[in-house]
């Protein structure tokens, strides 16, 4: 029987009778908040094999083992995470051991197993046998391991029944309990199951089966389940459902769950039922079950119930995230703000339609109307009085309203209004009435000629560049000396450089009238040599980076005809050299055989160029004899390291005062003193682990039904 | 794979309220769908009488809404009807069933409540 | 509320002669999504119901092709074009575009 969508059994041990004829769990399975100690002995459940999502416990009062609880469940597959975790098992006060001795498989995700006072037999289960990669999994905070004495079955008896693995380059036997070793199939199956007895199983089944190869057989399915058999994709006319089954179309069309009660209804695409259309897909038709896809962003309207949205904040304008099309008026008011530009066009850059007018007014803090990327028509459908669709008044530092070189933006009906903005060119709004289709629709009064642009160098002249040269962090550049009909108005040059991946960059991405910029910006003095050309050094930049560059001439405000002339040059775009690599990343071996190692790694965060080969060196150790003088097998304590790796728990370097002087044989040295690196890495690890504190807290404490 | 189970008495008393327990398997009433009860008088046709919704909101069949309550006990993963002041008509056979976005997709077997002193 | 009326309320059919169940609702039944949430039930001696056509014309996944589904507005019919002896009960069609939701009166199929 499929249970689902997700269990939650808290408060009452006796909830557990829900899991009675479950034989998967479609969702998740939280077992937690169950404060009175109970025997839980009477309370099995062997029907249950598989739980689809994640597995959490936590405070679960009296519960000693899982073993008996779950003796059958062999997989979690992890389909959707508990902050990134497919297995949870926190501050569980009474839990000895984990003991789900048939957990054979978590398919996606890693484990998390933190602050459980009483929690042994971590050490000696080999989680690489059970997830793809270990190195997320988190075992913090339990029973030290050598106040556990954990030990395999047989192991007192020097009959060991487990089979053993190398785990840190410690080879040792592998299990779950006392009595309960860790099942590993036999190397002839390689990534395949195997029965109890060692057969191998079919390729389509996942962690385990009742009979060999036999894909009817199967305990989990290693792709879908379909019709009792294990198949590696969903027959015709059915459907992919929660990353483990196939179901029919009706199945999907009738699906209504809490989580997408909101939308249309679940629709089938590229052969999978889901709850929406994924990114960049749109349903074909309001209730339709089949997605189509988006011609550039998909489409979401936005409406304002009060006609008019006001735009004062980063908060407003967060309202507005995600929308192409805003049916009503947008007022645009930002009189100052933070790192505005960039936080506007997050939230704004994707409007492409507003139906009634826009109106920017008193936004003392914009400096460019580019965060509205992606706006292309406004309908003027309402129109402010006198008929207008686009007002633009008293913007003391907008000097730019969009690149028209590479914008198509139409006013459909209504007037433009500009008045009062001293830094916008008139030229400016003259190319906008060309872009828009609105020439010819404003009167004289319409676009003032005298206080739009006052106080701007309106009249540009072009600077050239005439020399570029880079290396793996630097770049040189020379432009030509700029000569302004009075040469004495030239005061100096500022170059303004930026990455940029792409060669789409714009003179005001980014920039607001409050200090917030992305260019970076340095001032070039005049050379004191008519004849030498101006130019700049720009070091301390990452190799292999597309960098965009431009400079400007700084001019004294010289009025000629009632406008200021100025120069700047074309957006250059210049790649510095490539360099080393950084170091690889997550290097992890293990070895698969006598003879065999493996090796995986990352690629390196900073490949600085375009990676061609990697380089594999390896040497052989020395074995370390310090490993066969103890019988590890006796339950006596483990002799202590007569060294320290500066890692210890602090509430462990109790042992040894501060006064033992280190090395010879005069016994355990101190831990040395925590380099700056191990402490932020400390600081960090703390951090992290109330990160998910709180994300668990805030997600299972919920009000109580009604 | 779910199931549901309709309980309770099969004989009431006339103007005596008539107590109905479904119990599901296989499915959290709380994870969706709308979670319904319907009767059929003998030799008679359905008769859809209301529904409690995953999330506990309650629709009713207006004719019925002065006697009928629908409710949960979310930890039992049960939902109840109640109707109160009956008479031999509403002699049925009361089914649960789940609704979806579109139709009932899984129904009890019936259980037959007789009004009669 | 909306009443739905089926007829016939019953239909001796002959095994492999086609059969076809009328019903009309007393307004329309298109929801405000514009979708049509009308549906065909049967219900076999002794069982609870079983659903046969979702969404005026959709037949359920395993229903044999035999059964179609027609309609729009207020007028729905279920056509079965052979009669097999195992189609023998009463047939119900529902609406829940509007509360509350209503079911006809029922066709009761039977073999001549």
């Known amino acids: 029987e499929i249970c689902g969508p997700g269990i939650d059994i808290r408060n009452d041990y006796q909830q557990l009778k829900r899991l009675e004829n479950c034989t998967v769990i479609e969702g998740y399975l939280h077992i937690l908040l169950i404060s009175k100690a109970e025997d839980y002995r009477s309370y099995r459940f062997p029907k249950l094999t598989v739980i689809t999502e994640y597995l959490l416990l936590f405070r679960v009062a009296g519960l000693e083992s899982l073993g008996d609880l779950f003796p059958n469940l062999t997989v979690i597959r992890g389909w959707k995470l508990f902050y990134n975790y497919a297995l949870v098992i926190f501050e569980m006060t009474n839990l000895k051991d984990i003991g789900l001795y048939n957990l054979r498989n978590i398919t996606r995700g890693a484990i998390r197993i933190e602050k459980n006072a009483d929690l042994c037999y971590l050490s000696t289960v080999d989680w690489s046998l059970i997830l793809d990669a270990v190195s997320n999994n988190y075992i913090v905070g339990n029973k030290p391991p050598k106040e556990c004495g954990d030990l395999c079955p047989g192991t007192m008896e020097e009959k060991p029944m487990c089979e053993k693995t190398t785990i840190n380059n410690e080879y040792n036997y592998r299990c779950w309990t006392t009595n309960r070793c860790q099942k590993m199939c036999p190397s002839t199956c390689g990534k395949r199951a195997c029965t109890e007895n060692n057969e191998c199983c079919h390729p389509e089944c996942l962690g385990s089966c009742s009979a060999p190869d036999n894909d009817t057989a199967c305990v989990a399915c290693r792709h879908y389940y379909y019709a009792g058999v294990c198949v590696p994709a969903c027959p015709p006319n059915t459907y992919r459902f929660e990353g483990w089954r196939c179901v029919d179309r009706d199945f999907c069309a009738n699906i209504l769950s809490a989580e997408s009660s909101d939308s249309e209804g679940f629709v089938i695409h590229d052969g999978e039922c889901m709850q929406e259309c994924p990114s960049g897909f749109i349903r074909n038709g309001s209730q339709s079950m089949y997605c189509i896809p988006c011609e550039g962003p998909c489409p979401k309207v936005c409406e304002e119930e009060k006609k008019t949205k006001t735009i004062d904040s980063v908060t407003s304008a967060q309202m507005l995230q995600g929308c192409t099309i805003f049916k009503g008026n947008l007022l645009i008011n930002i009189r100052r703000g933070n790192n505005i530009a960039s936080e506007l066009e997050n939230f704004m850059g994707l409007i492409e339609v507003v139906t009634g007018y826009v109106k920017i007014r008193h936004s003392h803090a914009l400096v460019s109307l580019s965060f509205l990327k992606n706006l292309r028509l406004i309908l003027g459908e309402e129109q402010l009085e006198g008929n207008y669709s686009f007002y633009v008044l008293d913007n003391q530092n907008l000097q730019q309203l969009w690149d028209w070189d590479h914008r198509n933006l139409t006013i459909k009906a209504g007037k433009m209004y500009f008045a009062f903005n001293p830094k916008l060119c008139v030229s400016e709004i003259y190319r906008m009435e060309e872009v828009t289709g609105t020439k010819g629709r404003q009167s004289k009064g319409d676009i003032n000629t005298r206080n739009n642009g006052e106080r701007a160098s309106c009249e540009s002249d072009v600077l050239h560049f005439t020399s570029t040269t880079t290396s793996k962090n630097r770049i040189i550049i020379t432009w030509h000396r700029y000569r302004p009909p009075d040469y004495r108005d030239l005061i100096s040059f500022t170059v303004y450089y930026k990455e940029a991946p792409f060669k789409n960059v714009t003179e005001y991405d980014g920039q607001d009238a409050c200090g917030s910029n992305s260019w970076n910006m340095v001032d070039v003095d005049l050379p004191p040599n008519k004849d030498v050309e101006p130019g700049i050094l720009l070091h301390g930049l990452k190799p292999w980076t597309q960098y965009a560059v431009y400079v400007k001439a700084v001019t004294l405000t010289m009025v000629e005809n009632d406008h200021i002339r100025g120069a700047k040059s074309e957006i250059l775009y210049i790649r510095t050299n490539a360099s080393v690599p950084s170091i690889p990343l997550d290097v992890l071996s293990a070895s698969n055989s006598s003879s065999q190692l493996i090796v995986k790694w990352n690629p390196p965060s900073l490949p600085n160029g375009n990676l061609s080969y990697y380089i594999v060196r390896w040497q052989r150790q020395p074995q370390d004899g310090y490993l066969y003088r103890h019988n590890y097998c006796s339950k006596d304590k483990i002799p202590i390291r007569k060294y320290a790796d500066g890692t210890i728990d602090i509430e462990e370097v109790t042992e040894n005062p501060k006064t033992e002087v280190c090395g010879g044989e005069k016994g355990p040295c101190c831990a040395c003193p925590k380099t700056e690196a191990e402490k932020q890495a400390e600081k960090e690890e703390a951090e992290y682990r109330k990160v998910f504190e709180n994300f668990l807290h805030n997600s299972i404490f919920v009000p109580r039904p009604e | 794979q779910v199931q549901l189970q309709e309980s309770g008495p099969g004989l009431v008393k006339p103007s005596e309220t008539l107590s109905l327990t479904c119990t599901v398997s296989?499915?959290?009433?709380?994870?969706?769908?709308?979670w319904n009860w319907i009767r059929q008088p003998p030799g008679k046709g359905l008769e859809w009488i209301g529904y409690?919704?995953?999330?506990?909101?309650?629709n009713y069949k207006p004719s019925l809404k002065d006697r009928v309550t629908i409710s949960r006990d979310t930890s039992k993963n049960q939902f109840s009807l109640k109707l109160s002041s009956v008479t031999a008509a509403d002699t049925a056979v009361y089914y649960c069933?789940?609704?979806?976005?579109?139709?009932?997709?899984?129904w009890g077997q019936g259980t037959l409540v007789t009004v009669s002193s | 509320d909306i009443v739905m009326t089926q007829s016939p309320l019953s239909l001796p059919v002959t095994p492999g002669e086609p059969a076809s169940i009328s019903c009309r609702s007393s307004?329309?039944?298109?929801?405000?999504?514009?979708?049509?949430?009308h549906q065909w039930y049967l219900q076999k001696p002794g069982q609870s119901p079983q659903l046969l056509i979702y969404k005026v014309s959709n037949r359920l996944y395993g229903v044999p092709d035999r059964f179609s589904g027609s309609g729009s507005g207020t007028d729905f019919t279920l056509k079965i074009s052979r009669v097999e002896a195992e189609d023998v009960g009463v047939y119900y069609c529902?609406?829940?575009?509007?509360?509350?939701?209503?079911f006809g009166q029922g066709t009761k199929v039977e073999i001549k």
């Open positions: 529902f609406q829940g575009s509007h509360v509350p939701w209503t």
């Open positions: 296989g499915y959290s009433i709380t994870g969706g769908y709308l």
């Open positions: 409690i919704s995953y999330d506990g909101t309650n």
């Open positions: 069933a789940r609704y979806g976005r579109v139709f009932f997709d899984y």
């Open positions: 307004q329309s039944i298109v929801h405000s999504n514009g979708n049509t949430y």
